[in-house]
Interface confidence: medium
């Protein structure tokens, strides 16, 4: 057997809604022929399934084999290094991979201007891999919240944060003109999931958007 291969130092999941990626750190001094074996355990079925015999990358997309994540007790994964006939011990994820580990995101933010208001509509994520019945709003059916950050360019303020409890919001601009840039971070009040800020969407507000009322 020769010298034993060292195990990958760490293995962890990074997940968004129906985008479940397993990551690991490489073993020290790996050779060009070193690759990694990935196995998956579903809680309640106490046996390991081999998913990939020889991955040469440092991550693996497990979405397709964890589609029931949102209706299950979760998963553990393990990875070991393989080099020819040699292999290391397994390194197992430290924590159970469950719905709680999924980072919440939004699909996009649409902005429009109406009579001095900026109207925002939050589009929920619609990943291609998700089964038809597993929408964001069916899985997170209650207590959806969004933190809104608005930056005005140029202007005398950087951010205004607001928690809204639905997918629409409006901001009265009170005569301010300029470019307004909006980001949204989702959360679910009853859950501990982390949220990720969306990319910034901007809209320009000029005097033409204001109507005069007597």
């Amino acid at each position: 057997h020769g010298t034993e291969l060292p195990s990958p130092p760490s293995v962890w999941f990074e997940a968004e809604f129906f985008h479940h990626i397993l990551h690991w750190t490489p073993i020290p001094n790996q050779s060009e022929s070193t690759c990694y074996e990935v196995a998956l355990l579903r809680y309640g079925i106490e046996s390991w399934n081999s998913i990939s015999n020889c991955s040469q990358t440092l991550s693996y997309d497990l979405t397709a084999v964890t589609l029931d994540l949102y209706h299950s007790n979760g998963y553990r994964a393990r990875v070991r290094a393989v080099d020819g006939s040699r292999h290391s011990n397994w390194t197992v994820t430290n924590t159970r991979f469950s719905v709680d580990e999924v980072t919440l995101t939004v699909g996009s933010v649409n902005l429009e201007i109406h009579n001095g208001f900026i109207l925002g509509k939050i589009q929920l994520p619609r990943p291609k891999m998700a089964p038809a019945n597993d929408t964001y709003e069916s899985i997170f059916s209650h207590f959806r919240e969004y933190e809104i950050a608005i930056r005005k360019v140029p202007g005398n303020f950087t951010f205004t944060h607001k928690k809204v409890k639905h997918e629409n919001f409006s901001l009265l601009t009170s005569g301010e003109v300029g470019e307004f840039c909006v980001q949204v971070k989702p959360s679910v009040a009853s859950r501990s999931n982390k949220g990720m800020w969306s990319k910034e969407e901007c809209i320009s507000l000029t005097r033409q958007y204001f109507t005069v009322t007597n």
């Epitope: 205004t160 607001k162 928690k163 901001l171 601009t173």
Partner: nanobody, 127 residues
Framework: EVQLLESGGGLVQPGGSLRLSCAAS????????VGWFRQAPGKGREFVSA????????YFGDFVEGRFTISRDNSKNTLYLQMNSLRAEDTAVYYC????????????????????WGQGTLVTVSS
Amino acid sequence: EVQLLESGGGLVQPGGSLRLSCAASGRTFSSHTVGWFRQAPGKGREFVSAITWNGDTTYFGDFVEGRFTISRDNSKNTLYLQMNSLRAEDTAVYYCAAATGQVWSLQYLRESSYAYWGQGTLVTVSS
């Protein structure tokens, strides 16, 4: 009529922290958007931060850069401004102010939207 009384100012070294308080009496504090403005020596009053009646919306001036947090305790009729990583340019008199109205609006960035003002508390950042 709302009366506002600021406290918590003082001398602090650069990089230090201070927590300002604003105690309100008179009309119901909890129905107002309240905020902080500041006035540096020889300069005009500038917007620092504001918070809506239920605390779900906060506003910050562009110089804040994440260093300050604003909060309120309606049961104690008190507004707070936690100031961290203070710089010499933060030296100013800090004023507490209360506005009427509850819409999510940029009007709260303007001095003219605030009907009630405190007397101010001096913050000096110096080594």
